[in-house]
Each structure stands twice: as structure tokens, then as C-alpha cells.
């Protein structure tokens, strides 16, 4: 169940000075999600620039329905998306020489989920078969967060599947699931 | 990791009742419905009921009905199952369950805890 | 209360063998129907979900099928770890019900 993006309002999260967030691995082919990008802005150096605007992630808002099975949400559901530049990175040449290119130094910075929220969701059934609800977990607010290698990717492991996540009617579930449960989980998830 | 832990084994005496609890890890127990079904020794699985966490609604079996209460305490995740005023029939493995959908299939199942009812 | 009848309660079956367990419900549940698997003193575990969407991590060789009142768990070639009870499980309305379940024990 794709998303379906009627909205695409962004929120620039300024995280704590001193920070030096990294951007955010691209979300996979989608097309409907129209990410806010850097602005046009020139490229900076993270320890050269004083303006914190530039270490900020976003907070997209899309909005999509809940499937479970079969069901779906009477009304589209809306959630963030944390996307965006979290910080700058620090410009290196590329291995051939030719150029320069984005690469990351020092501490690893993601714009992730911060805060969720459950919403319990109607969803309406085909043939005759009786309404159902779903709790669903959404994404409330985004922030840049800084990882270490100890955090074995477990902040990462939902980035992208988060947003994706569905369902209160069905309530999100604590993991995320495979790309057929996904579906389910979009239409069934968590 | 998500985990479902309950509590041990109990024995009782007809007439008596028994609280079973089951500690929720990993997840906001908030965010899901929480179930209760329980298996007699080598009979099949029983649905008794279900909690919204988050605001105490609940479905119970028919055939439950006043004899069992469920409650669950947010602040420690841990969801309980009372059920009073037992018969020897009522001996079997409770376990919590519990899914994000209303009504629900099963995700994730506690270890179950053994009530033996016998005087 | 709507009743899920499965059938048959025991089978006897070869490492290999493809082997069908069925459900009937008592009326129409939809595709709203999952099946577990339960192996002696563990809690049953998800296999199957409206009516054919496996849980994750279940392998390919389970597959499900039906909608209305029938219903059917397929394994396509069974496995040493796969001697286990079946159950199925409606729940298009409360109260929840579950199917009597299906013990596949080694031949």
C-alpha cells in the first residue's frame, strides 16, 4: 500500500549544539515522497560553520490509509517522515580524484523518530464483514540523533520502515516485519 | 527484544482465586491489545479475553463474564488476569498474548503460567 | 459464538509428505482466520494470518488457503521440526475462537 503523499510540509528539527549530524541514508525508491532537500545551499564543513540551521532534520508529513487485510481505514491517517539534511559532512575527494563528494566523518548522525504516538484506527471491511480497528504507531516528532557503533544499528533498524509502520486497530507492533507481513502491517503492521 | 513473562505456577483450592501477571519488554504495552487464553492439559486453546491498555476497555468471553478481571498497570507494563471462585476444570496453562488489531490474530504469546486447581 | 471445526485431529505422516489440515467455520468469517503451530509445553506460535499471509520468518513450505467458512493449512513437504498440533483461530468477530486442533505426529 503505497503512500499517499497529499502533503509535504516540512519541519526543521535543530538538534543540540556541538552535534554533527550526517545525512540520512535515502529511503528506497519512493516516488511519492517528496523529501525537502538542502535548500540549494552551498556545502559546508562541520567544524567551519557557525549557523546551526544546518544541523537540522525534517519532519515531513504524509498521509496515508491503514490497511489491514482486506480493510481499510475509512479516513487517511497523516505522519511524519524524518528526512532531510541532518548536518553537514565533511566534503572529502573521491577515490578517483576527480571532484569532491559527500562522505561522513566523525560522529554518526541520522535524523530518526523521536517520539511515536498510537492511534487507534477504524477500518472499514469489504462484503459485508464487520468494522475493525487497529492501533496504529505513528511518528511524532524527528530529531538528529548521534550513533555509536553500539547502538548495532537497533536506531536504524525501523528507519524507513517506521513510517511506514501501521495500525492501530491494529496496534503497531513492536517489530517491524518482512516485506510481505509489511504489507500486511502496513495493511497489518508493526 | 520483545518478551511476554509471567508469573510462576500456582496451585488453589476450589473456590478460591488466583492473579496471574504478565510483564510486558520492548514495547509500549499501551499500543496494543492484550489477550487471555488458556489451555486445559492436553485439550485445545480458549480464548478468554482481552484489555485496551491505554483505556481499560475489555472483552471477555461470555463464559467468563463475572468471574474474570483484567487489569493492567501502564507504569510497569504488566498486564494481570484474576479469575475467581476456580473449579478443577479451571486448571490449565493461561497465557497473555497480544496484537495491535481488534479483533485479533496472536503475535506474540507469553511462556504461560500452570494453575492447578485441586483440593 | 462461531465454532471452527478442524479436522482431522491427528494425522500420521512422513518426513517429505505433503500434508492438508482443514477448518470449517460454523459461518461466514471471511479471510479473517490464522494458524498456529504448538509443540508439547511451549506456547503456540503464528504461522498464518488472513487466511494465507505468512508471519514472519515461517517457511514457504507452510502456505494457507480459504475464505468464507473453509480453510486450509498446507505444508508442502514436511519436516522433522514440523511434528507438531495445529490450530486454527477465528477472529472476524468476538468472542475469539479456535479450531479443536490438528496433533501430525511421525509415521
Known amino acids: 500500500q503505497g503512500w499517499q503523499a497529499f502533503k509535504n510540509d516540512a519541519t526543521e528539527i535543530i538538534p543540540e549544539l556541538g552535534e554533527y549530524p550526517e545525512p540520512p541514508p535515502e529511503l528506497e525508491n519512493n516516488k511519492t515522497m517528496n523529501r525537502a532537500e538542502n535548500g540549494g545551499r552551498p556545502p559546508h564543513h562541520p567544524f567551519e560553520t557557525k549557523d546551526v540551521s544546518e544541523y537540522s532534520c525534517r519532519e515531513l508529513h504524509f498521509t496515508r490509509y491503514v490497511t489491514d487485510g482486506p480493510c481499510r481505514s475509512a479516513k487517511p491517517v497523516t505522519e511524519l517522515v524524518c528526512s532531510g539534511q541532518c548536518g553537514p559532512a565533511r566534503l572529502l575527494p573521491n577515490a578517483i580524484g576527480r571532484g569532491k563528494w559527500w562522505r561522513p566523518s566523525g560522529p554518526d548522525f541520522r535524523c530518526i523518530p523521536d517520539r511515536y504516538r498510537a492511534q487507534r484506527v477504524q477500518l472499514l471491511c469489504p462484503g459485508g464483514e464487520a468494522p475493525r480497528a487497529r492501533k496504529v504507531r505513528l511518528v511524532a516528532s524527528c530529531k538528529c540523533k548521534r550513533l555509536t557503533r553500539f547502538h548495532n544499528q537497533s536506531e536504524l533498524k525501523d528507519f524507513g520502515t517506521e513510517a511506514a509502520r501501521p495500525q492501530k486497530g491494529r496496534k503497531p507492533r513492536p517489530r517491524a516485519r518482512s516485506a510481505k507481513a509489511n504489507q500486511a502491517e502496513l495493511e497489518n503492521a508493526y | 527484544e520483545v518478551q511476554l513473562v509471567q508469573s510462576g505456577a500456582e496451585v488453589k483450592k476450589p473456590g478460591a482465586s488466583v492473579k496471574v501477571s504478565c510483564k510486558a519488554s520492548?514495547?509500549?504495552?499501551?499500543?496494543?491489545?492484550m489477550h487471555w487464553v488458556r489451555q486445559a492439559p492436553g485439550q485445545g486453546l480458549e480464548w478468554i479475553g482481552r484489555?485496551?491498555?491505554?483505556?481499560?476497555?475489555?472483552i471477555y468471553d461470555p463464559k467468563f463474564q463475572g468471574r474474570v478481571t483484567m487489569t493492567t498497570d501502564t507504569s510497569t507494563s504488566t498486564a494481570y488476569m484474576e479469575l475467581r471462585s476456580l473449579r478443577s476444570d479451571d486448571t490449565a496453562v493461561y497465557y497473555c498474548?497480544?496484537?495491535?488489531?481488534?479483533?485479533?490474530?496472536?503475535?506474540?504469546w507469553g511462556q504461560g503460567t500452570l494453575v492447578t486447581v485441586s483440593s | 459464538d462461531i465454532q471452527m471445526t478442524q479436522s482431522p485431529s491427528s494425522l500420521s505422516a512422513s518426513v517429505g509428505d505433503r500434508v492438508t489440515i482443514t477448518c470449517k467455520a460454523s459461518q461466514d468469517v471471511f479471510t479473517a482466520v490464522a494458524w498456529y503451530q504448538q509443540k508439547p509445553g511451549k506456547a503456540p506460535k503464528l504461522l498464518i494470518y488472513w487466511a494465507s499471509t505468512r508471519h514472519t520468518g515461517v517457511p514457504s513450505r507452510f502456505s494457507g488457503s480459504g475464505s468464507g467458512t473453509d480453510f486450509t493449512l498446507t505444508i508442502s513437504s514436511l519436516q522433522p521440526e514440523d511434528f507438531a498440533t495445529y490450530y486454527c483461530?477465528?477472529?472476524?468477530?468476538?468472542?475469539?475462537?479456535f479450531g479443536g486442533g490438528t496433533k501430525v505426529e511421525i509415521k
Open positions: 520492548g514495547f509500549n504495552i499501551k499500543d496494543y491489545y
Open positions: 498474548a497480544y496484537d495491535a488489531g481488534d479483533p485479533a490474530w496472536f503475535t506474540y
Open positions: 483461530q477465528q477472529y472476524s468477530s468476538y468472542p475469539l475462537t
Open positions: 484489555i485496551d491498555p491505554e483505556n481499560g476497555d475489555i
